[in-house]
């Protein structure tokens, strides 16, 4: 009964606190996408290898607006979507020479979220309503994870390590409040 992925009434999957995000099924017109291999980080190696090219874990960067009901974020957010199959590829000889093949009975590796970050976004709502905010949980990095034959698709949502937390017992900063303050939301499973 945790926060689960949900599709709201807009045209995108919004990764909130309900679930770790999945790749967006539909993208808004003004979204941009660019690709980076591992975001400049060395790949996560399930096995020791001298050939890093054997491991592929792509991080696709999506920029989109967050929506909630009739509201839309004042600014777009950028998130990662983990994509692609991970190695290791097996080098097997054949008549032509050394060619990479996937070993049929080898372990299965998937490119899945590794770390997450929460970002607070201000929502613009119709009718001059009080400002509202929400926190969206975004993928910060991807990794290759080895799956055994006991894993299934639902277990691909890897509950990996959290990002570093702030110092203990921070006092709230005083804040000059206007007529209204920003807000944010959460949700309770039935």
């Amino acid at each position: 009964q945790g926060w689960q992925a949900f599709k709201n009434d807009a045209t995108e999957i919004i990764p909130g606190l309900r679930e770790y995000p999945e790749p967006p099924q539909e993208l808004e017109n003004n979204q941009t996408m660019n690709r980076a291999e591992n975001g400049g980080r060395p790949p996560h190696h399930p096995y020791d290898t001298k050939d890093v090219s054997e491991y592929s874990c792509r991080e696709l960067h999506y920029t989109r607006f967050v929506t909630d009901g009739p509201c839309r974020s004042a600014k777009p957010v950028t998130e990662l979507v983990c994509s692609g199959q991970c190695g290791p590829a097996r080098l097997l000889p054949n008549a032509i020479g050394r060619v990479k093949w996937w070993r049929p009975n080898g372990p299965d590796f998937r490119c899945i979220p590794d770390r997450y970050r929460a970002q607070r976004v201000q929502l613009l709502c119709p009718g001059g309503a009080a400002p509202r905010s929400r926190k969206v949980r975004l993928v910060a990095s991807c990794k290759c994870k080895r799956l055994t034959r006991f894993h299934n698709q639902s277990e691909l949502k890897d509950f990996g390590p959290e990002t570093a937390r702030p110092q203990k017992g921070r006092k709230p900063r005083p804040r000059a409040r206007g007529a209204k303050a920003n807000q944010a939301e959460l949700e309770n499973a039935y």
Epitope: G16, R173, A181
Partner: antibody, heavy 118, light 107 residues
Framework: QVQLVQSGAEVKKPGASVKVSCKVS????????QHWVRQAPGKGLEWMGW????????EYASKFQGRVTMTEDTSTDTAYMELSSLRSEDTAVYYC???????????WGQGTTVTVSS | DIQMTQSPSSLSASVGDRVTITCKAS??????VAWYQQKPGKAPKLLIY???TRWTGVPSRFSGSGSGTDFTLTISSLQPEDFATYYC?????????FGGGTKVEIK
């Protein structure tokens, strides 16, 4: 599974203060907004305010301004609500709730009964 | 403050009945309305937000509608576990406010 576990019942005298705690598990508190809602015996729900544990931002209902303080300890994922200058009409069950927005209450604690009596 | 007036304050119904609860806001709140269910001695649970969006895991027999000042929560076929008190909440303007509640009792 997201769970919120609140501290036990309190009995206070008028004029005193009470501090209720709310331990959040299943999700880092800094990734949420923390809300407090109270319910007087046999009455409806009353929103008191919300806080953002990550930056210490707060929004309090005007009725409680100056009397309520909402804080969090992000290292223990615990939220606190302190209400001062208690009066008999503050006798109620106090609920913490958490969510990914400032406006709806997704997960709730079990409630803490605060009785103000001389 | 925005007042949320629920009606009826209580109703008696039987399992299988269609139940409708209404909530009227004292001013336009667009669709910034949520509905909660509360059973005796328990914390409330979120059912509906943005007037008509069902929260995770809420059965499809619960539906919400409305905009502006008039809102409705409908239970299409009342189940034994649905006997409870239901509250509407507006989040259009501070402070967030709740309706007085509607108690659904067994006939």
């Amino acid at each position: 599974q997201v769970q919120l576990v609140q501290s036990g019942a309190e009995v206070k005298k008028p004029g005193a203060s009470v501090k209720v705690s709310c331990k959040v598990s299943g999700f880092p508190i800094k990734d949420t907004f923390q809300h407090w809602v109270r319910q007087a015996p046999g009455k409806g729900l009353e929103w008191m305010g919300w806080s953002d544990p990550e930056i210490g931002d707060t929004e309090y209902a005007s009725k409680f301004q100056g009397r309520v303080t909402m804080t969090e300890d992000t290292s223990t994922d615990t939220a606190y609500m302190e209400l001062s200058s208690l009066r008999s009409e503050d006798t109620a069950v106090y609920y913490c709730a958490t969510g990914d927005t400032t406006y709806k209450f997704d997960f709730w604690g079990q409630g803490t009964t605060v009785t103000v009596s001389s | 403050d925005i007042q949320m007036t629920q009606s009826p304050s209580s109703l008696s119904a039987s399992v299988g009945d269609r139940v409708t609860i209404t909530c009227k806001a004292s001013q336009d709140v667009h669709t910034a309305v949520a509905w909660y269910q509360q059973k005796p001695g328990k914390a409330p649970k979120l059912l509906i937000y943005w007037a008509s969006t069902r929260w995770t895991g809420v059965p499809s027999r619960f539906s919400g509608s409305g905009s502006g000042t008039d809102f409705t929560l409908t239970i299409s076929s009342l189940q034994p576990e649905d006997f409870a008190t239901y509250y509407c909440q507006q989040y259009s303007d501070y402070p967030w406010t709740f309706g007085g509640g509607t108690k659904v009792e067994i006939k």
